[in-house]
């Protein structure tokens, strides 16, 4: 049974709460290290691979040392969702061409999703101002050619990993200041 | 073959500072964090810090915040770790070693660099 | 900081037997499916090397007779048959929070 009726919630641990975001943050890391090695291997593609319609890393947004949780929570959130719909529209323009890296992408998309969902429940137990909705985004143009399609999957899986990473680094180094 | 090379062993007076470089090649450089580990005589192996070469400067074991600083020249795919305020007790061997993104285990490691600190 | 202590930490041996090298955290380091620690070898004058991470994957380049084992707060390095090139100091670390810690070593010497 739970607390009796009128009676507030224990309020969350946040370190705990912090803890079980970074864990999650940290698999969905390793996953996409994985496929990462998986496309490497099957269309390997020398060289910095851009997209526009990425978001600028976050590791620009300053350094770690002197970032506050709403703010690294805000930005991983803002990225993140950025990411999960270019790992849709992947999925979507290069379905053929990438079918040897499922079900690793839909696994991927999975997990970001479950990320985001995990983000936005930090977010409100911590008591943090809810973002309005994003503005829809305007459609993303298809690959001009498999081959674009390719560098755009570089592109987007490289810029994910360095934004797990720095998500890991700074919501760990918040951890410790918790 | 990946490999990192630092550069040679220093004498320093206690109160000065010493920089260290890292020079990796053989991997895309903005891959991997880089890390920095002390060992100093008879004490166990400690983390110092790491760094991530694409940006948003580096994190630090709290021992070391406030005497340890690390950069990276991307383009000379060079890391550096400077280390002021000298004592007798950073007497050790510095090594830089390339860590795994989010994961901090670390499969290459440079030569170290012995740091003597002495009056 | 989480403090990883080993053990024995000195352990003497003859080539061709089975070496068990244990590594205790003072407080668990398996989350999700994952264990943060990591084994390494060290030689006199030389870097460490990384054998096993993430608890039981064996680094490329090292001989599968190097195996890792554990969850939680016990963890365990095994050499299933000690060459002479083995005899070295051994060191778990993890890296399930910051700052990420080394245990003490345990020195592995020839019989």
């Known amino acids: 049974p739970g607390p009796p009726p009128g009676s507030p919630r224990a309020s969350p641990d946040p370190r705990a709460e912090l803890d079980s975001t970074v864990l999650l943050t940290r698999s969905l890391l390793e996953d996409t290290r994985q496929l990462t090695i998986q496309l490497k291997d099957k269309f390997p593609a020398d060289g910095d691979h851009n997209l526009d319609s990425l978001p600028t890393l976050a590791m620009s947004a300053g350094a770690l040392g002197a970032l506050q949780l709403p703010s690294v929570l805000t930005r991983l959130r803002a990225d993140l969702l950025s990411y999960l719909r270019h790992v849709q529209w992947l999925r979507r323009a290069m379905g053929s061409s990438l079918k040897t890296l499922e079900p690793e992408l839909g696994t991927l998309q999975t997990r970001l999703d479950r990320l985001l969902r995990r983000l936005q429940l930090l977010m409100s137990r911590l008591a943090l101002p809810q973002l309005p909705p994003d503005p829809p985004a305007p459609p993303l143009a298809p690959p001009s050619s498999t081959w674009g399609g390719i560098r755009a999957a570089h592109a987007i899986l490289g810029g994910l990993h360095l934004t797990l990473d720095w998500a890991v680094r700074g919501l760990l180094l918040l951890k410790t200041r918790l | 073959e990946v490999q990192l090379v630092q550069s040679g062993a220093e004498v320093k007076k206690p109160g000065a500072s010493v920089k260290i470089s890292c020079k990796a090649s053989?991997?895309?450089?903005?891959?991997?964090?880089m890390d920095w580990v002390k060992q100093a005589p008879g004490q166990r192996l400690e983390w110092i810090g790491d760094?991530?070469?694409?940006?948003?400067?580096?994190i630090y074991n709290q021992k070391f915040t406030g005497r340890a600083t690390l950069t990276v020249d991307k383009s000379a795919s060079t890391a550096y770790m400077e280390l002021s305020s000298l004592r007798s007790e950073d007497t050790a061997v510095y090594y830089c070693?390339?860590?795994?993104?989010?994961?901090?285990?670390?499969?290459?490691w440079g030569q170290g660099t012995t740091v003597t600190v002495s009056s | 900081d989480i403090v990883l202590t080993q053990s024995p930490a000195s352990l003497a041996l003859s080539p061709g037997e089975r070496a068990t090298l244990s590594c205790r955290a003072s407080?668990?380091?398996?989350?999700?499916?994952?264990?943060?620690i990591h084994w390494y070898q060290q030689k006199p004058g030389q870097a460490p090397r990384l054998l096993i991470y993430?608890?039981?994957n064996l680094e490329s380049g090292v001989p599968a007779r190097f195996s890792g084992s554990g969850s939680g707060t016990d963890f365990t390095l095994t050499i299933s048959s000690l060459e002479e090139e083995d005899f070295a100091t051994y060191y778990c670390?993890?890296?399930?929070?910051?700052?990420?810690?080394f245990g003490q070593g345990t020195k592995l010497e020839i019989k």
């Open positions: 070693a390339r860590g795994e993104l989010g994961h901090w285990y670390f499969d290459v």
């Open positions: 993430l608890a039981s």
């Open positions: 053989g991997y895309t450089f903005t891959d991997y964090n």
């Open positions: 760094i991530n070469p694409h940006g948003g400067g580096p």
């Open positions: 670390q993890h890296s399930r929070d910051l700052p990420p810690t």
């Open positions: 407080k668990s380091v398996s989350t999700s499916g994952y264990s943060y």
